[in-house]
């Protein structure tokens, strides 16, 4: 904390300008009026204050607004936002999308910090809902933010936001989230041709139903094993050996290395051993020849 000292003669700040970068911390504390700072916050970002000097300016604002900063100040924090703690941000009431964008811009290119996560939380609570504009903004800055949302929240994500998503941004999504995102991705990429479409949709296939996987198997997509292993087990089980062979193309040989893991293991148990043998991979565990397979779920539906 900067020691309280009187402002030297002639150094009282009349406005927030470049001359203040030459002030020592104690001079900033003594010579800059907090109310002046608050009304001219828009200038602070353009002035190359050191991080130590920004600490002093933050301290002045904290004293002026102990209950939390007003949005008129928050919107113009700029680099000063990097000095805020989550505890500071929890005192804010942020309702303007422009304010949110301005602060996300400061953090652009960096991982989502605790400050940003708290800011987003405050913003969503302040608005009362996760509307399309908000989600568009958040996914533009943090495509990976999608995986932090609940399936219910994801249902309001506009398909247009899907274009910004990179494969690594879905790494932390669970199957329930992909179930919601996949139909949106399918819609977003529907006008692309076969090979381009597959490149884009591939990351979302963990939410694809059986019929879509069957359709893909007719398009020579050559799905890699890593993608296949992330598919929903219930979507893979109904696929025939021929369909899986077409779906994987040259990657079909990789099934042998994965035969003990889901969904490959469960799929093998559903196939006739005769059909599995046609792959020539030595896959074992299929239904022996001569056995009849009864689909009990179908029988229950008929009775």
């Amino acid at each position: 904390e900067v020691e309280k000292t009187a402002c030297p003669s002639g150094k009282k700040a009349r406005e927030i300008d470049e001359s203040l970068i030459f002030y020592k911390k104690w001079e900033l504390e003594a010579c800059v009026d907090a109310a002046l700072l608050a009304t001219q916050m828009d200038r602070v970002n353009a002035i190359p204050f050191t991080y130590e000097q920004l600490d002093v300016l933050k301290h002045k604002l904290d004293e002026l607004y102990p209950q939390g900063y007003p949005e008129s100040v928050i919107q113009h924090l700029g680099y000063l936002f990097l000095k805020m703690s989550p505890e500071d941000i929890r005192k804010w009431n942020v309702t303007s999308l422009e304010t949110l964008k301005a602060l996300l811009e400061v953090n652009k290119g960096h991982e989502m910090s605790p400050q940003v996560a708290t800011l987003i939380d405050r913003f969503v609570k302040g608005r009362g809902q996760l509307d399309k504009d908000t989600l568009d903004t958040l996914t533009a800055f943090y495509p990976g933010y999608l995986c932090s949302l609940s399936p219910e929240e994801l249902s309001s994500v506009p398909p247009s936001s899907i274009w910004a998503v990179r494969p690594q941004d879905l790494d932390t999504c669970d199957p329930r989230q992909l179930d919601v995102l996949y139909p949106k991705a399918r819609l977003a990429f529907q006008n692309m041709n076969g090979s381009e479409y597959f490149v884009k949709i591939q990351s979302f296939l963990g939410g694809a139903p059986t019929e879509d996987l069957k359709a893909l198997s007719q398009q020579n997509v050559s799905m890699d094993l890593a993608t296949f292993m992330k598919l929903r087990t219930d979507a893979v089980l109904p696929l025939t050996v021929a369909e899986v062979q077409k779906l994987l193309g040259p990657h079909v040989e990789g099934l042998k290395a994965e035969e003990r893991h889901r969904p490959v293991r469960d799929w093998i148990l559903r196939q006739r051993q005769d059909d599995l043998d046609t792959l020539g991979l030595g896959l074992q565990g299929g239904i022996p020849n001569g056995y009849l397979v009864l689909d009990l779920s179908m029988q229950e539906a008929l009775s």
């Epitope: 970068i21 991080y51 130590e52 920004l54 680099y79």
Partner: nanobody
């Protein structure tokens, strides 16, 4: 990687002159605003002088008329010519890109002025 190497410090008598140099690499030097900072023992960091990419200069009140900042874009070097040195100019001097917002940090070059 941004690299700034300061040199030219030393021990002098009051009233004498020194010229500090700072050679930069790892960024577009002629697009950058540069500054010289100093920190005296037991005191806090202080900005001494700045030079912007268009060549305009600014100085702390305590060094106005005595110090001159300049730059040579061809050599990626910024200079601080210090005349009429005083004992209170004793400090470690560091140069920085103003955009870094770091101030006094790193090695720097020591200037000692005795009376």
């Amino acid at each position: 990687e941004v690299r700034l190497v300061e040199s030219g410090g030393g021990s002098v008598q009051a009233g004498e002159t020194l010229r500090l140099s700072c050679t930069a690499s790892g960024f577009t030097f002629d697009d950058s605003d540069m500054g010289w900072y100093r920190q005296a023992p037991g005191d806090e960091c202080e900005l001494v002088s700045t030079i912007s990419s268009d060549g305009s200069t600014n100085y702390a009140d305590s060094v106005k008329g005595r110090f001159t900042i300049s730059q040579d874009n061809a050599k990626n070097t910024v200079y601080l010519q210090m005349t009429s040195l005083k004992p209170e100019d004793t400090a470690i001097y560091s140069c920085r890109t103003m955009a870094s917002r770091i101030g006094c940090w790193g090695q720097g070059t020591l200037v000692t002025v005795s009376s």
